[in-house]
C-alpha cells in the first residue's frame, strides 16, 4: 500500500453567493488526520494519534495551507457561471501517494453539486473531463479561470504537487507512529446459516500498517476466492485498520478450518471455536 | 477600532495569588485565540499560552503549567491569567496579545507591569 | 524547545542605510517566523508574518526572507522612528518561542 495524504475542500454558494468560510478535511494514509475548525481557525488534529503524528509541532503550517486553499476554492466557485438558485457546492479532491518503489502520483478532482467534472495528473499536468455536457461546460469555465489566474500556471501545479509530496515526506519522516508495527487482535465468531451451515468470520482489528493478509483455510490450504467474502480494511478512528473474511462451512467440519493471518512478517492461524 | 486594556500595574506581595484581566472590544471575542506573553526588565519576549475563548481550550507552556491558569468571561469579553505563588522571578510585565489565526499576535495590549514585593 | 539566536545583539545604523536582522533556529521551521517591532515602554507589534507575508498598516520598507532555519529582516531605509528592539518568534513547535531581540540605534 502507498503512503497518502488526501485533502478534501468544499465551499457552498446559495442563490448565486459565495458563502465565507470553508470545509475541509485531510486524511493521511486512509485515516482521518486533521479538520479544519472554522469556530478556532485552524486546522485540527483528529485524535490521538494525528496528535501523535504531529508530536510537539502545532497545526500552523497545516491552517496556513487549508486556509489558502479554501480561499482559492472559494474565487473558483465565484466564476461558476449560470448558478441557479438555491444551495450548491464545489469540491476540490487531491491526492498524492508515495509508493514502496519510491514512485510518486498526484492528482486533484473537482466535483460541482456531487458530480465529478474535472481531474487532472497533476505530475503529467493532463486534464480530463466526463463526458456529460454540464461537466463539459463546468470544465470550460473553470478551466478558463485558472487559466486568467497568473497564479494557476505550470509552476503552480508543479508546486501543488510538490508541496503534498513534501508534507506528505515530513510526517513520514518525523513520525515514529507511521512507522510502528501494531499486530492484529483477531477473533473468530460462528453464526447460524441454512440448515446443517454455519457462517464463520473471522476479524482483525486494530493493526498497523494496513497491509494484511487474511484468508479462510481449510485442511491448512487457502480456499478460493470465490467462496470467501471479504471485508474492506478501514481505519478504526484510533490510527489503526480492520477488517474481515467469513465463509460458510458445514456443521461439524469446524476443525477442519483456521483463520490464516499475516501481518508484518508475522502470521498466526485461529481455529473456529466450538 | 481593536483595543485590549490591561491594567498598567499591580503590586502583589509574594505567596498570594493575583488576576491579571485583559478587557477585549472592537472584536469578535469568542472567536479568536488570546496569547499571553511575559517581559522581565530588560529581558525579551516568553510565550506563557493561549486560550480560546469559545469553549476555554487552552495552550500553556510547559514552563508555565504550576505558575499560571487562563480563563475568561464571555459575558464581558475578558481574559484573565492567574499568577499562584509570585516570587520576585515574576516580576514582570504581562501583554495578551491575539491574531486572526492562533500562531500570529496581530494585537497586543498595553501590558500589565506586575512587582512582587512584601 | 526551539531556540531562536538573533544576531548581533546591537545594531547601530545611519538613517537612509539599509539594516539586516538575523535569525537562526536550532532546527528547520519551515517558514514559521514571525517578526515583531517593540519601542521603548510599547507593546510589541507584528511587522512580518511566515518569514515574508507583509502585514496591512506596516511601512513597505519592512521585509523579511528565510527557511529552515535562517531569516532576515530587512529594513531598507532606516527612519528614526525604526529605533526599537526587534524580535523573531517561531510558531511550528510547541511552545512558541521567541528570540533573544536585537536593539537598532540610529547614529
Known amino acids: 500500500e502507498p503512503h497518502s495524504l488526501r485533502y478534501n475542500l468544499t465551499v457552498l454558494s446559495w442563490d448565486g453567493s459565495v458563502q465565507s468560510g470553508f470545509l475541509a478535511e485531510v486524511h493521511l494514509d486512509g485515516q482521518p488526520f486533521l479538520r479544519y475548525d472554522r469556530q478556532k481557525c485552524r486546522a485540527k488534529p483528529q485524535g490521538q494519534w494525528a496528535e501523535d503524528v504531529l508530536g510537539n509541532k502545532t497545526w500552523d503550517r497545516e491552517t496556513r495551507d487549508l486556509t489558502g486553499n479554501g480561499k482559492d476554492l472559494r474565487m473558483t466557485l465565484a466564476h461558476i457561471k449560470d448558478q441557479k438558485e438555491g444551495l450548491h457546492s464545489l469540491q476540490e479532491i487531491r491526492v498524492c501517494e508515495i509508493h514502496e518503489d519510491n514512485s510518486t502520483r498526484s492528482s486533484q478532482h473537482f466535483y460541482y453539486d456531487g458530480e465529478l467534472f474535472l481531474s487532472q495528473n497533476l505530475e503529467t499536468e493532463e486534464w480530463t473531463v466526463p463526458q456529460s455536457s454540464r461537466a463539459q461546460t463546468l470544465a470550460m469555465n473553470v478551466r478558463n479561470f485558472l487559466k486568467e489566474d497568473a497564479m494557476k500556471t505550470k509552476t503552480h501545479y508543479h508546486a501543488m504537487h510538490a508541496d503534498c509530496l513534501q508534507e506528505l515526506r515530513r510526517y513520514l519522516e518525523s513520525s515514529v507512529v507511521l512507522r510502528r508495527t501494531v499486530p492484529p487482535m483477531v477473533n473468530v465468531t460462528r453464526s447460524e446459516a441454512s440448515e446443517g451451515n454455519i457462517t464463520v468470520t473471522c476479524r482483525a482489528s486494530s493493526f498497523y500498517p494496513r497491509n494484511i493478509i487474511l484468508t479462510w483455510r481449510q485442511d491448512g490450504v487457502s480456499l478460493s476466492h470465490d467462496t470467501q467474502q471479504w471485508g474492506d480494511v478501514l481505519p478504526d478512528g484510533n490510527g489503526t485498520y480492520q477488517t474481515w473474511v467469513a465463509t460458510r462451512i458445514c456443521r461439524g467440519e469446524e476443525q477442519r478450518f483456521t483463520c490464516y493471518m499475516e501481518h508484518s512478517g508475522n502470521h498466526s492461524t485461529h481455529p473456529v471455536p466450538s | 477600532q481593536v483595543q485590549l486594556q490591561q491594567p498598567g500595574a499591580e503590586l502583589v506581595r509574594p505567596g498570594t495569588s493575583v488576576n491579571l484581566s485583559c478587557k477585549a472590544s472592537g472584536y469578535s471575542f469568542t472567536r479568536y485565540w488570546m496569547n499571553w506573553v511575559k517581559q522581565r526588565p530588560g529581558q525579551g519576549l516568553e510565550w506563557i499560552g493561549m486560550i480560546h475563548p469559545s469553549d476555554s481550550e487552552t495552550r500553556l507552556n510547559q514552563k508555565f503549567k504550576d505558575k499560571a491558569t487562563l480563563t475568561v468571561d464571555k459575558s464581558s469579553s475578558t481574559a484573565y491569567m492567574q499568577l499562584s505563588s509570585p516570587t520576585s522571578e515574576d516580576s514582570a510585565v504581562y501583554y495578551c496579545g491575539y491574531g486572526n489565526f492562533f500562531y500570529v499576535m496581530d494585537y497586543w495590549g498595553q501590558g500589565t507591569s506586575v512587582t512582587v514585593s512584601s | 524547545d526551539i531556540l531562536l539566536t538573533q544576531s548581533p545583539a546591537i545594531l547601530s545604523v545611519s538613517p537612509g542605510e539599509r539594516v539586516s536582522f538575523s535569525c537562526r533556529a536550532s532546527q528547520s521551521i519551515g517558514t514559521s517566523i514571525h517578526w515583531y517591532q517593540q519601542r521603548t515602554n510599547g507593546s510589541p507589534r507584528l511587522l512580518i508574518k511566515?518569514?515574508?507575508e507583509s502585514i496591512s498598516g506596516i511601512p513597505s520598507r519592512f521585509s523579511g526572507s528565510g527557511s529552515g532555519t535562517d531569516f532576515t529582516l530587512n529594513i531598507n531605509s532606516v527612519e528614526s522612528e525604526d529605533i526599537a528592539d526587534y524580535y523573531c518568534?517561531?510558531?511550528?513547535?510547541?511552545?512558541?518561542?521567541f528570540g533573544s531581540g536585537t536593539k537598532l540605534e540610529v547614529k
Open positions: 518568534q517561531q510558531s511550528n513547535f510547541w511552545p512558541f518561542t
Open positions: 511566515f518569514a515574508s
